[in-house]
């Protein structure tokens, strides 16, 4: 990996072993302006593999609200406006980092957690398995 | 919002003002098994709006490696295997949380940052703007 010289102005940390505890400033630097996935684009409705967005709320997690995509159909919308099962709608998933309160209900202590979320859907050619 | 009783076993935190600094355990609890997006599915190749995955590396960020999707075509692949420009390939984007080393090069001090990443692509009906 890349070795980076340590900044002499870094805060001290006694815990040099894993599990490693670090200080995190929660005053988020947001490089983006729009946080509502429904407002950010209408792709979920215009896609040939449209999806619905479901609100997943968990007060023990940061962020507490995550939007989860569910494909509306198993097939894809064709030019005639029919759901065509010769193609398949599938969710595009991504692993994201969240903060989980640990111990539970603590406002200032968290553990990093990786969770898999469905972000939207795409239309794919199915893999056909025939029985011998 | 939901009020949760504070756990009496929580670590102390002197800083009660924003920017709020919290303790985060970096020993990640991973609810998923497969972390390589290329291995987890071949949707990026089988989609009617296929995409390439580009590695974005930044040692000042945690996670340091993020995979960015770039749609291969402006149009979508039709049943004949040709790119059809009556439809559009568009990236599905998601805001994710990352940790940014702050001050720079510090191993134990971070700031939360929201960044927008493209996770994959979907095929949409274009919005046609007619000239009056």
């Amino acid at each position: 990996g890349i070795t980076i010289p340590r900044n002499p102005g870094c805060p001290n940390s006694e815990d040099k072993n894993f599990p490693r505890t670090v200080m995190v400033n929660l005053n988020i630097h947001n490089r983006n302006t729009n946080t509502n996935p429904k407002r950010s684009s209408d792709y979920y409705n215009r896609s040939t593999s449209p999806w619905n967005l479901h609100r997943n709320e968990d007060p023990e997690r940061y962020p507490s609200v995550i939007w989860e995509a569910k494909c509306r159909h198993l097939g894809c919308i064709n030019a005639d406006g029919n759901v065509d099962y010769h193609m398949n709608s599938v969710p595009i998933q991504q692993e994201i980092l969240v903060l989980r309160r640990e111990p539970p209900h603590c406002p200032n202590s968290f553990r990093l957690e990786k969770i898999l979320v469905s972000v939207g859907c795409t239309c794919v050619t199915p893999i056909v398995h025939h029985v011998a | 919002g939901i009020t949760i009783p504070r756990n009496p076993g929580c670590p102390n935190s002197e800083d009660k003002n924003f920017p709020r600094t919290v303790m985060v355990n970096l020993n990640i609890h991973n609810r998923n098994t497969n972390t390589n997006p290329k291995r987890s599915s071949d949707y990026y190749n089988r989609s009617t709006s296929p995409w390439n995955l580009h590695r974005n590396e930044d040692p000042e960020r945690y996670p340091s490696v993020i995979w960015e999707a770039k749609c291969r075509h402006l149009g979508c692949i039709n049943a004949d295997g040709n790119v059809d420009y009556h439809m559009n390939s568009v990236p599905i984007q998601q805001e994710i949380l990352v940790l940014r080393r702050e001050p720079p090069h510090c191993p134990n001090s971070f700031r939360l940052e929201k960044i927008l990443v493209s996770v994959g692509c979907t095929c949409v009906t274009p919005i046609v703007h007619h000239v009056a």
Partner: antibody, heavy 119, light 112 residues
Framework: EVKLKESGPGLVAPSQSLSITCTVS????????VHWVRQPPGKGLEWLVV???????TYNSALKSRLSISKDNSKSQVFLKMNSLQTDDTAMYYC?????????????WGQGTSVTVSS | DIELTQPPLSLPVSLGDQASISCRSS???????????LHWYLQKPGQSPKLLIY???NRFSGVPDRFSGSGSGTDFTLKISRVEAEDLGVYFC?????????FGSGTKLEIK
């Protein structure tokens, strides 16, 4: 309570068309799809068509040229039209709700309407 | 079209016994999203079908826990651990992974 009720003509002459209505209550057609399934006397079940919550449709290709499905969300009604009926179209016609939880199963069914094709 | 084969046409059982009904598909029922859309319905005489099991092994609400579903790919089984009189009727497997959605020919559960 979820309910689906089919209403049809009962008797149809050969080569004529059939129109059946499915009236639903206890749920909204903007949130659930509705299937049509038929069952000839003493035989198995045959799926015909579905109209999804968003208005898109999926047909059984073997019957597509003869079938037409539509709905009126405000009246909670789904309509099936079938053309050029023959005697082997004699069957019990059921409408069934597509579950709302992405299982793609038919979770509630109407009691059916009997259709006889005869001159 | 996907063919769902349900042998036998009739299954005589004694009340209190276990019953096992099989369903075989002519093609894999695994969707590209990884799920398998194989369901089981029961049709009692003079009634419309009722959903028992969805997506291979999930009991629909109100269905007694003596009903269980299992299987993968192309081979599926519905088990009734202790048959009761109200369980008699025709059991249909059905798939919604591929269009047209299809039903098995049905297995009639009757008293021995």
């Amino acid at each position: 309570e979820v309910k689906l009720k089919e209403s049809g003509p009962g008797l149809v002459a050969p080569s004529q068309s059939l129109s059946i209505t499915c009236t639903v209550s206890g749920f909204s057609l903007t949130s659930y799809g509705v299937h049509w399934v038929r069952q000839p006397p003493g035989k198995g079940l045959e799926w015909l068509v579905v109209i999804w919550s968003d208005g898109f449709t999926t047909y059984n290709s073997a019957l597509k040229s003869r079938l037409s499905i539509s709905k009126d969300n405000s009246k909670s009604q789904v309509f099936l039209k079938m053309n050029s009926l023959q005697t082997d179209d004699t069957a019990m016609y059921y409408c069934a709700r597509n579950d709302g939880s992405y299982y793609y199963a038919m979770d509630y069914w109407g009691q059916g309407t009997s259709v006889t094709v005869s001159s | 079209d996907i063919e769902l084969t349900q042998p036998p046409l009739s299954l005589p059982v004694s009340l209190g016994d276990q019953a096992s009904i099989s369903c075989r598909s002519s093609q894999s029922l695994v969707h590209s999203n990884g799920n398998t859309y194989l369901h089981w319905y029961l049709q009692k005489p003079g009634q419309s079908p009722k959903l028992l099991i969805y997506k291979v092994s999930n009991r629909f609400s109100g269905v007694p826990d003596r009903f269980s579903g299992s299987g993968s790919g192309t081979d599926f089984t519905l088990k009734i651990s202790r048959v009761e009189a109200e369980d008699l009727g025709v059991y249909f497997c059905s798939q919604s992974t591929h269009v047209p959605f299809t039903f098995g020919s049905g297995t009639k559960l009757e008293i021995k």
